[in-house]
Interface confidence: low
């Protein structure tokens, strides 16, 4: 039985050209996290494997950095980065948990102050 829940930064906005931190947290379960995948729609951004560490997709390696924690930092944002992002926790024995974050990248004067850098 899957008892865990995923908390995310939810819907966030950021300025074009800026940076953002995508953060998910798995709670309410004692399952072991074996791997976390970060995906943008149907594209794999990064993998954090419990044994092998981080792997960043080559097409994103210049704009994506690991962390903090199991989160992901995106920089040099463009309006094309607007969309859904998913953190996919692979756990044992529970199975897979998925969290969703919607990121909207806005022109510099539009993004609300304080909406960037969603750091806990």
């Amino acid at each position: 039985m899957m008892t865990g829940t995923i908390e995310t930064t939810g819907n966030i906005s950021a300025e074009k050209g800026g940076s953002i931190i995508l953060q998910c947290h798995l709670s309410s379960t004692t399952a072991q996290v074996t791997q976390v995948n970060w995906e943008q729609q149907d594209q794999l951004l990064a993998i954090c494997n419990a044994d092998l560490g981080w792997h960043i997709s080559p097409s994103f390696k210049d704009r994506v950095a690991p962390g903090p924690g199991l989160g992901l930092t995106l920089q040099s944002l463009t309006v094309n980065d607007t969309g859904e992002y998913f953190c996919i926790y692979h756990t044992y024995p529970d199975g897979t948990y998925t969290g969703r974050i919607f990121l909207e990248v806005l022109e510099s004067s539009v993004a609300e102050h304080g909406a960037r850098f969603q750091i806990p």
């Epitope: 954090c48 560490g53 981080w54 390696k61 690991p66 962390g67 903090p68 199991l70």
Partner: nanobody, 113 residues
Framework: EVQLVESGGGLVQPGGSLRLSCAAS????????MGWFRQAPGKEREWVAS???????WYADSVKGRFTISADNSKNTAYLQMNSLKPEDTAVYYC???????WGQGTLVTVSS
């Protein structure tokens, strides 16, 4: 106790250099990556640079070519060599790692003539 201790900050003139250190201790396994963030007065905390255990590095556009991040895996220590410092680099610099969800106490870097 798991902790991160940053050091090496101080007052430096524009164009000068500083080397920050971050010592990680108390971990049951070595971090797979370590990184630096900074927070200037009245501004949001921003990512500066990260280094993977295997040595791959990333930099924010604002510091690329001026800052160099490195790590000594045997000591679980990360370093940030900061050259050609500018007044806008003034901030409290924080170290973080995948093994610790929080932050250290930070080290203040002031760039001023």
């Amino acid at each position: 106790e798991v902790q991160l201790v940053e050091s090496g900050g101080g007052l430096v003139q524009p164009g000068g250099s500083l080397r920050l250190s971050c010592a990680a201790s108390g971990f049951t396994f070595s971090p797979s990556w370590m990184g630096w963030f900074r927070q200037a007065p009245g501004k949001e905390r921003e990512w500066v640079a990260s280094v993977l255990r295997g040595g791959y590095t990333w930099y924010a556009d604002s510091v690329k070519g001026r800052f160099t991040i490195s790590a000594d895996n045997s000591k679980n220590t990360a370093y940030l060599q900061m050259n050609s410092l500018k007044p806008e680099d003034t901030a409290v610099y924080y170290c973080t790692t995948d093994s610790l969800p929080g932050w250290g106490q930070g080290t203040l870097v002031t760039v001023s003539s």
